[in-house]
């Protein structure tokens, strides 16, 4: 009863089609399959970047695997073939492990990349990143920022740049169609007569770092005798309404100031018939339903009800 | 394997210069930097330079007047040469591959007396 | 430049005794660019662990890293004979790179 054995993948490798950090890894089936002919032959796949405490497994019938890497780190893979059970009169039969790791060779110090790296996508309509130069890198040094998300053919290169001292420090993009929901990288390069400059690697996605316009159309409406209701519109933009968190600060006889958070567009508030003054202002984000994070609009401009009659709606600016 | 083998002059006279090869196998030039280290009991281990896998060199601001590294990616060589030599200078001096930004395999070490 | 301080420079240890060192840095250094090595009498340092916590191939897994900003440590669970060495820390984030002055293990 001799045992069953199988070979590893062969010619596993990394390939990196220039998309900043999206990669393909590939390998061709084991030699000397023919005994197998009948049997769909499986591969357990893992991967990480270097120094990550956790793989990544996938289990696959296909010959390529393509994902997302941070290319500030090397990577790491390893694959096995699997044989299944009903292939081996048995338990699962498999290969030993093939390796292989992947890592763009830097040139230059670290310090010398981009810094505080900061991409703001306003009202989920305009992207736009600013950095600051490395540290103790000289005024010849200029930097160039490439992106690519899938969609787009090749990685392309940022067409405005933000400048300061003919430095350039940012990036306004170019309208991004369909690039939200997906991963979208982006690659800062350098180059000086001085030193090398070493490259930086960013990973994000779109919807999760918008800054809404703050909501617009303030209004007061006179409830009750002690209810007061506040209210406000979305601002314009593709934002739908059904994605949208408000902050609201309420300000009454400039002493107490209540903070609510919210869901739609109104807010209703318990007073006095003291009140003699009342101020609010809200701001906006981008919700849990629509984004895994994202950054609060400014402030809206502040509206002011004084005096006695709300239900004429006095507005103060 | 991957390995790092330096050759060089043991004993240099003051105002003399040092040259030294570091020859590696197992890999290419062409894919990883190599570092440049030396070791002396007052000072400790000090970083002199590197020279990256594109051909560019970075430099200790303490040592750029003095100091130049080359390599022939065709040969695997790897060459150093520091100038102006002082007794202060006397120390090990190895050779290392940048890898994940660490100096993954050393070599043996070039230990150097300056004296007259 | 960035200065590493190691403490202490040199203690001693016995056999399954647990072993701390501690790296200061004067200014914060990124944990993927804080390393160690170990070097033996008569031999090159070897890289050891990497990116504070990244134990390099063949190092066993007794020891381990941790830290953040100026504070880094290498620890070793239970010391064994085999782990006598002089243990330096290395920062890859500024230039110049720099060293610490080592912690020398000895056993007890």
């Known amino acids: 009863d001799t045992e069953i054995k199988v070979n590893p993948p062969q010619d596993f490798e990394i390939v990196d089609p220039g998309y900043l950090g999206y990669l393909y890894l590939q390998w061709q089936p084991p030699l000397s399959l023919d005994h197998f002919k009948e049997c769909t032959v499986e591969y357990e796949l893992k991967y990480r970047n270097i120094g990550s405490e956790t793989w990544k497994t996938i289990i696959t019938k296909n010959l390529h695997y393509k994902d997302g890497f941070d290319l500030n780190k090397g990577i790491e893979a390893k694959i096995h073939t699997l044989l299944p059970w009903q292939c081996t009169n048995g338990s699962e039969v498999q290969s030993s492990w093939a390796e292989t790791t992947y890592w763009i060779s830097p040139q230059g110090i670290p310090e010398t990349k981009v810094q505080d790296m900061d991409c703001v996508y306003y009202n989920w309509q305009y992207l736009l990143c600013s950095w600051k130069p490395g540290i103790g890198v000289l005024l010849d040094t200029n930097y160039n920022l490439f992106y690519w998300y899938e969609g787009l053919d090749h990685a392309l290169q940022c067409v405005d740049y933000i400048k300061a001292d003919g430095q350039n420090i940012g990036c306004r993009f170019p309208y991004l169609e369909a690039s939200d929901y997906k991963d979208f990288y982006i690659c800062v390069n350098g180059s000086s007569e001085n030193k090398p400059i070493r490259s930086s690697y960013f990973t994000f996605q779109l919807q999760n770092i918008v800054k809404p316009l703050p909501p617009v159309y303030l209004t007061f409406t006179r409830e009750s005798s002690c209810e007061i209701k506040l209210k406000w519109s979305i601002p314009l933009g593709p934002i739908p309404a059904r994605c949208f968190d408000y902050e609201i600060e309420i300000r009454e006889d400039d002493t107490t100031l209540v903070t609510a958070t919210v869901e739609n567009e109104t807010y209703t508030l318990k007073t006095t018939n003291e009140t003699r003054q009342l101020c609010f202002v809200v701001r906006s984000k981008v919700n849990i339903y629509c984004s895994d994070d994202g950054i609060w609009s400014e402030w809206s401009d502040k509206q002011c009800w004084e005096g006695e009659d709300l239900s004429k709606k006095t507005l103060l600016r | 394997q991957v390995q790092l083998k330096q050759s060089g002059p043991g004993l240099v006279q003051p105002s003399q210069s040092l040259s030294i090869t570091c020859t590696v196998s197992?890999?290419?030039?062409?894919?990883?930097?190599v570092h440049w280290v030396r070791q002396s009991p007052g000072k400790g281990l000090e970083w002199l330079g590197v020279?990256?896998?594109?051909?560019?060199?970075d430099y200790n601001a303490a040592f750029i007047s003095r100091l130049s590294i080359s390599k022939d990616n065709s040969k695997s060589q790897v060459f150093f040469k520091m100038n102006s030599l002082q007794a202060n200078d006397t120390a090990i001096y190895y050779c290392?591959?940048?890898?994940?930004?660490?100096?993954?395999?050393w070599g043996q070490g070039t230990t150097l007396t300056v004296s007259s | 430049q960035i200065v590493l301080t190691q403490s202490p420079a040199i203690m001693s240890a016995s056999l399954g005794e647990r072993v701390t060192m501690t790296c200061t840095a004067s200014s914060s250094v990124s944990s993927s660019y804080l390393h160690w090595y170990q070097q033996k009498p008569g031999s090159s340092p070897k890289l050891w662990i990497y990116?504070?916590?990244n134990l390099a191939s063949g190092v066993p897994a007794r020891f381990s890293g941790s830290g953040s900003g100026t504070s880094y440590s290498l620890t070793i669970s239970s010391m064994e004979a085999e782990d006598a060495a002089t243990y330096y820390c290395?920062?890859?984030?500024?230039?110049?790179?720099?060293f610490g002055a080592g912690t020398k293990l000895e056993l007890k």
């Open positions: 290395h920062q890859y984030h500024r230039s110049p790179l720099t």
């Open positions: 990116s504070t916590s």
């Open positions: 020279i990256w896998s594109g051909g560019s060199t």
């Open positions: 197992g890999f290419s030039l062409t894919s990883y930097g």
């Open positions: 290392a591959r940048d890898r994940y930004d660490a100096f993954d395999y």
